[in-house]
């Protein structure tokens, strides 16, 4: 049987002779040279050679464990004379023994990392990793330890993990933003004689809102004319903030001062400036100087830095208003007045008031722009601005009168202002209802009692035009003796009904019925209208045969009775034919 074990060979042999590996030996070998040793497998004959007589194995070349840590070979012992094996072929291994010939290598030549400024000590920044090609299972050749060569006292590295952390309190980006840290990785557990490698870590401090805005000056002064319309920019102020990005965003506001309601401040998002603008119309005569307190504040505040103080600053803004010569100003932009339509001439409706806003307080006089009141219905007292009627009004003719009043400075007629007056004429129930049309109707001589011969409608010019409730009745003087009755339908219509059986056109050819119409409003208005009823001869079919001719050629045409039809283009005979009057034997 074979007498050998696995062989160990130190890597990176530097001797001048071949490196001895070991000896193959069979107990069949009597030392007489009758056996021949043969080597085959990984590197046999090239890397590894064998003395065929003695079985000694040597390595011909310098071996690198990191390149190949194990070689598998086969050994044979054969009878030199017969060539037959005296031992079965056996496999053996040559294991390359590690030496510390590799330094640790970082995964990156340069690392980049960020960490917020003002971070707590021990805040994780980045983890670096170095690897060592040596055998980790034997000795400490591959046991890497990390240390910091450059970057103290700002940062530290955990020796075993390579985790870089902040090491200094209150690192301020505004003071220093960039740090270059050099980390060493050393094998042999960091002991003397270990190999090492380094890497560079570029660390940038990111911004946090740790700086409040600051005005570079405590007072600003601007000027603006009193005529500046709302929205006019007056001036710009700028607070500086050492932070960047959204942490340096600034909102401006007016926090105090007499001009709080007169001015606005808006933030220019591009420049982060505060633009002071006019909010309301200024008046030099009321106030010449405004002093505002303007505040600049960060909208994005980090609560943990509030202990540093408020993240805002304030400055005083003094605004001087320049005088501009102005026309008179009315107390209102427009005046709405009301007057009843039954107002007498010289009735006062109301008054307007205007004043010279300038410091001079020039007196003003008032007048009506006659282009807006051609009929001279209204007048104004030039001194006190009282408006009064100079003619009678009628709401039904004109509901609204829109006139313009002018106020002029007496000492400077070029300075004048105009104001619209909207005068509403209030309704008074001063119109009586009247028939909607001229009513002329017909009745057959043989008509029966209670037959409807005409429906009446009324209209009223008063308000509400379509909302009146009318009552109809025969005038009292006709009520008792009338041959007809009025039936009020309670829907703003009334019917004329026959009151008796039969009429004689030879006795009475035409009836005039006085009908009283009243509105149910207050003061009560009523009128009397007359309805003409003609008595006609009719045949047994209810067709009219003869009537007084004037009934048929009345300029307003015919108002036909119940169940009747009327064609405006009919001839005279056709008209007779068209009148269908119901009657009963």
């Amino acid at each position: 049987s074979w007498m050998w074990n696995q062989f160990f060979l130190l890597e990176e042999y530097t001797g001048s002779d071949y490196q001895y590996v070991g000896k193959l030996h069979s107990d069949q070998d009597r030392g007489d040279g009758s056996l021949k040793y043969i080597l085959s497998g990984d590197g046999a004959g090239d890397l590894f050679i064998i003395n065929e007589n003695t079985g000694d194995i040597q390595a011909t070349k310098r071996l690198d464990r990191e390149e190949k840590p194990v070689y598998i070979l086969r050994a044979q012992a054969v009878n030199r004379r017969t060539g037959r094996p005296v031992e079965p072929e056996s496999e053996f291994i040559i294991k390359i023994h590690d030496i510390n010939d590799n330094e640790p290598i970082f995964t990156k030549d340069v690392y980049t990392a960020t960490v917020p400024e003002m971070a707590d000590v021990g805040t994780f920044v980045v983890q670096v990793t170095a690897t060592d090609a040596d055998d980790p299972t034997y000795g400490n050749s591959a046991k890497v330890v990390y240390s910091i060569l450059q970057g103290q006292p700002y940062f530290s590295v955990e020796s075993e993990t390579g985790i870089i952390k902040t090491a200094l309190l209150n690192m301020d980006r505004e003071n220093r933003e960039q740090y270059q840290v050099v980390i060493q990785a050393k094998d042999m557990g960091g002991q003397m004689g270990g190999l090492s490698g380094t890497t560079t870590v570029n660390i940038t401090l990111t911004d946090v809102n740790d700086n409040p805005p600051r005005f570079p000056q405590s007072t600003y002064q601007f000027k603006t004319p009193e005529s500046s319309p709302p929205g006019t920019p007056i001036g710009r102020i700028k607070a500086s903030d050492a932070d960047v990005g959204e942490n340096a965003e600034i909102e401006y506001s007016i926090t105090d001062g007499e001009g709080h309601e007169m001015f606005d401040v808006i933030t220019d998002q591009e420049t982060q400036e505060g633009i002071i603008t006019v909010k309301k119309l200024l008046d030099f005569e009321k106030k010449k100087v405004y002093t505002l307190k303007v505040e600049a504040s960060n909208p994005h505040v980090e609560p943990r830095f509030l202990y540093l103080g408020p993240f805002k600053d304030s400055a005083t803004v003094r605004i001087v208003v320049d005088d501009v010569d102005e026309p008179p100003v009315f107390s209102k932009l427009a005046y709405i007045l009301q007057i009843r339509e039954d107002a007498r001439i010289n009735t006062t409706i109301g008054s307007v008031a205007a004043q010279d806003p300038d410091a001079a307080r020039n007196p003003v006089k008032y007048s009506v722009d006659r282009h807006t009141d051609m009929d001279r219905i209204f007048n104004i007292d030039s001194g006190n601005g009282s408006i009064f009627t100079s003619k009678l009004l009628d709401r039904e003719t004109l509901l609204w009168h829109n006139i313009t009043v002018i106020a002029t400075e007496i000492n400077n007629p070029k300075q004048s202002s105009r104001v619209p007056l909207y005068i509403k004429v209030l309704d008074v129930n001063d119109n009586a209802p009247e028939f909607a049309e001229f009513y002329e109707t017909f009745v057959c001589e043989k008509a029966k009692a209670d037959q409807l011969i005409q429906t009446l409608r009324a209209v009223d010019k008063d308000d509400p035009y379509s909302g009146h409730q009318f009552s109809f009745s025969l005038a009292p003087e006709a009520a008792s003796s009338s041959n007809f009755t009025i039936q009020d339908n309670k829907d703003n219509t009334a019917g004329i009904l026959t009151r008796k059986n039969g009429y004689n056109r030879h006795e009475m050819s035409t009836y005039l019925l006085p009908v009283v119409i009243s509105d149910n409003d207050y003061p009560v208005q009523s009128s009397t209208g007359t309805v003409t009823v003609r008595v006609c001869a009719c045949d047994h079919h209810g067709n009219m045969q003869s009537c007084h001719a004037e009934a048929l050629i009345h300029p307003t045409g015919l108002s036909t009775g119940a169940g009747s039809e009327f064609r405006h283009d009919s001839g005279l005979n056709d008209i007779f034919e068209a009148q269908k009057i119901e009657w009963h034997e």
Epitope: R340, L426, D427, V428, N429, D463, P464, G467, H468, Q469, S471, S473, P476, A479, D488, V516, S518, N520, D521, Y522, P523, V524, S526
Partner: antibody
Framework: QVQLLESGGGLVQPGGSLRLSCAAS????????MNWVRQAPGKGLEWVSV????????NYADSVKGRFTISRDNSKNTLYLQMNSLRAEDTAVYYC???????????WGQGTLVTVSS | DIVLTQPPSVSGAPGQRVTISCSGS????????VSWYQQLPGTAPKLLIY???NRPSGVPDRFSGSKSGTSASLAITGLQAEDEADYYC???????????FGGGTKLTVLG
């Protein structure tokens, strides 16, 4: 159907105030003038006040002039009577009534009693 | 103050005819229509006659009205027990744009 419903009556001391309301339904309230009529206990009917359909014209009996104010809210179909400086002789049942048919009052409310007493 | 004059009371036996008069002036009855109201005990007035002589629907034709000059009258025929009530005449007054009432007449149905 037409309905008029008064409310707001009650006991009040002389010199006090009261506001009566009359809720109208079943007709176009804004087209009619409206009246208040009162009836003292055991006495006849006495017209009190009238208001035009739009509310722009009003009139009062001499006995209440300057103390009573009639008004209306057409959007709410409601008639009002504001009574100030009340006297013992104002004690009565107050009716709201609609004038129609040539000023005949065709519809009346059920009435609300106002008692002025110390 | 009462402007129209009515008798304080009238009476009649069932089936009889009674009339109630009402007199005024030219500014009221003389130039405007007359209306009549019936008031049963404890109830609101009810329109009985309008436009001098017209009856609203539901009012029996036993009730009729008339007007002459500055006077008006209400006639009730076929008197019935349920007719016992107070009756008031009324008119619009054109002079001061107000409504005027009579003092009321108490109708008693005898027996």
């Amino acid at each position: 159907q037409v309905q008029l419903l008064e409310s707001g009556g009650g006991l009040v001391q002389p010199g006090g105030s009261l506001r009566l309301s009359c809720a109208a339904s079943g007709f176009t309230f804004s087209s009619f003038a409206m009246n208040w009529v009162r009836q003292a206990p055991g006495k006849g009917l006495e017209w009190v006040s009238v208001i035009s359909s739009s509310g722009s014209n009003t009139n009062y009996a001499d006995s209440v002039k300057g103390r009573f104010t009639i008004s209306r809210d057409n959007s709410k179909n409601t008639l009002y009577l504001q009574m100030n400086s009340l006297r013992a002789e104002d004690t009565a049942v107050y009716y709201c009534a609609r004038p129609s048919y040539f000023q005949a009052m065709d519809y009346w409310g059920q009435g609300t009693l106002v008692t002025v007493s110390s | 103050d009462i402007v129209l004059t009515q008798p304080p009371s009238v009476s009649g036996a069932p089936g009889q005819r009674v009339t109630i008069s009402c007199s005024g002036s030219s500014s009221n009855i003389g130039s405007n229509f007359v209306s009549w109201y019936q008031q049963l005990p404890g109830t609101a007035p009810k329109l009985l006659i309008y436009d001098n002589s017209n009856r609203p629907s539901g009012v029996p034709d036993r009730f009729s009205g008339s007007k002459s000059g500055t006077s008006a009258s209400l006639a009730i025929t076929g008197l019935q027990a349920e007719d016992e009530a107070d009756y008031y005449c009324s008119s619009y007054d054109s002079f001061d744009h107000s409504w005027v009432f009579g003092g009321g007449t108490k109708l008693t149905v005898l027996g």
